[in-house]
């Protein structure tokens, strides 16, 4: 049941995560003009990583698209195909994650097929999260330097009087969008491993180990054959990790923690 | 078409109030800024301040903030101004207008005359 | 505020001929955002409410004559009417759209000579 909850748990939370990843991704606002210490401007720029925008005070807001490839900085491309990697990897992800859940049955699918399936979309849901994360801080970091670099410079003039009111930028809602978005999928994605373990079946779980009775040469695996020796006669209803013998109750609410990050 | 008409000329005595209306006709009047310009006599313009009829938010020059309180009723589809504590100086025609791209006001109201006269 | 300059005070021109208004803003007007001036040209004929004419410094506004253009970037600009129609006699006001308070220049007063 623990299982179940877990990897359940796991898929909503790495959607929600995706979801927000999307969002981010097609939000303009990944920078807005900072208004602090500025003049008070009639006009608001805010950019994209597709497109950047003016909304003037008369309500009228222009949208324009990068309609270039080369023209743009390497770390927006980088920016932009971490994004995107993060969707598709996600994506992927919760196609994966979708047959792997234990509720659903699909045919005659095996244990251990939903298993590796789990762990499989758990693994991609924390890549996608961390190139979201990636992506939104390395725009965040080139926002930082930006800001720094146009304050140093920001009035610009002959003899003193000011000519030019140089734009500033700062984090936009898109970043924290991504942040948030990113650090969920990763989450889900932990949960999913986590739930992976618990989904493993019998056979795969059993460690073999050789009994060597005395006088004879005899290798036994617990649970092959019913011999006078005892071992076997109740491994039915039990798993054995690690050397040690867990009901399958117990095996199943493993113990998780989460951290937020 | 596209019009913005303004209420008569008022006369007041210095201390006192005037609100000046402008009653919009022809498009929809909350997808557009209002705002409200004065000409003294022989001078030249002066921006007061806008508002939005549609979140009801405004901005006011330095020198109106405070004396002068604009508002707007969208079931009447009419802007408001009103100017208190009025001085002799405040004499002017009282235009408002429709804000358009660029900030720029493509459509201006025939004016309002506010005397001022003890 | 934004002090806004206009030059010639008055200005008189034979009919045909070309009229030229400068105008000086103590800041610029350009917005790194879009690459846009945010000034503003208005015509106000004796009488008469102002009329726009150009938005963004240069994008005239419909049913403008094309006599009319309107140029400049940064912190100056110039209206300039190719050839002045008797009809063209008003005051020419240029405004700062970028910051607010919004500001007028003084007007310049175009007459025929």
């Known amino acids: 049941m623990a299982v179940t909850a877990c990897q359940g748990l796991g898929f909503v939370v790495s959607l929600i995560g995706i979801a927000g990843i999307i969002a981010a991704t097609c939000m303009d606002q990944w920078s807005t003009q900072d208004l602090y210490n500025n003049p008070v401007t009639a006009v608001f720029n805010y950019q994209g990583l597709w497109r950047s925008c003016v909304r003037e005070s008369s309500g009228f807001t222009e949208c324009r698209g990068y309609f270039t490839l080369l023209g743009l900085p390497a770390m927006l491309q980088a920016v932009r195909a971490l994004m995107i990697v993060g969707i598709v990897l996600g994506a992927i992800g919760l196609l994966v994650s979708i047959f792997a859940l234990k509720c659903i049955r699909i045919g005659s699918m095996e244990d251990s097929a939903k298993a590796n399936m789990t762990l499989t979309s758990g693994i991609m849901f924390i890549v996608s999260g961390l190139c979201a994360i990636a992506g939104v801080s390395v725009f965040a970091n080139m926002l930082v330097t930006n800001f720094w670099m146009s304050t140093a410079n920001m009035y610009t003039g002959m003899g003193g009087m000011v000519q030019t009111v140089q734009t500033r930028y700062t984090f936009g809602a898109a970043l924290f969008v991504g942040w948030v978005a990113g650090g969920l999928t990763l989450i889900g994605g932990v949960m999913m491993c986590i739930a992976c373990r618990g989904l493993a079946p019998e056979e795969t779980n059993y460690k073999a180990v050789s009994y060597h009775a005395s006088g004879h040469s005899v290798a036994y695996k617990p649970g092959g054959f019913k011999a006078s020796t005892g071992f076997g006669s109740n491994t039915k209803n039990k798993k054995i990790y690690d050397g040690g013998a867990r009901t399958e109750d117990e095996v199943q609410s493993y113990p998780s923690k989460h951290d937020y990050v | 078409q596209v019009q913005l008409v303004e209420s008569g000329a008022e006369v007041k005595k210095p201390g006192a109030s005037v609100k000046v209306s402008c009653k919009a006709s022809?498009?929809?009047?909350?997808?557009?800024?209002v705002h409200w310009v004065r000409q003294a006599p022989g001078q030249g313009l002066e921006w007061m301040g806008y508002?939005?009829?549609?979140?009801?938010?405004?901005k006011y020059s330095q020198e109106f903030q405070g004396r002068a309180t604009l508002t707007s009723d969208k079931s009447a589809s009419t802007a408001y101004m009103e100017l208190s504590s009025l001085r002799s100086e405040d004499m002017a025609v009282y235009y408002c207008?429709?804000?358009?791209?660029?900030?720029?006001?493509?459509?201006w109201g025939q004016g309002t005359l506010v005397t001022v006269s003890s | 505020d934004i002090v806004m300059t206009q030059s010639p005070d008055s200005l008189a021109v034979s009919l045909g001929e070309r009229a030229t208004i400068n105008c000086k803003s103590s800041?610029?007007?350009?917005?790194?955002?879009?690459?846009?001036?945010?000034l503003t040209w208005y015509q106000q004929k004796p009488g008469q409410s102002p009329k726009l004419l150009f938005f963004?410094?240069?994008t005239r506004q419909s049913g403008v004559p094309d006599r009319f253009s309107g140029s400049g970037s940064g912190t100056d600009f110039t209206l300039t009417i190719s050839s002045l129609q008797a009809e063209d006699v008003a005051v020419y006001y240029c405004?700062?759209?970028?910051?607010?308070?919004?500001?007028f220049g003084q007007g310049t007063k175009v007459e025929i000579k």
């Open positions: 800041q610029s007007l350009l917005n790194s955002g879009n690459q846009k001036n945010y």
């Open positions: 405004q700062n759209d970028y910051y607010f308070p919004f500001t």
């Open positions: 022809g498009y929809t009047f909350t997808s557009y800024v």
């Open positions: 963004w410094a240069s």
């Open positions: 207008s429709r804000s358009y791209y660029g900030n720029s006001f493509d459509v």
């Open positions: 508002i939005n009829p549609y979140n009801a938010d405004s």
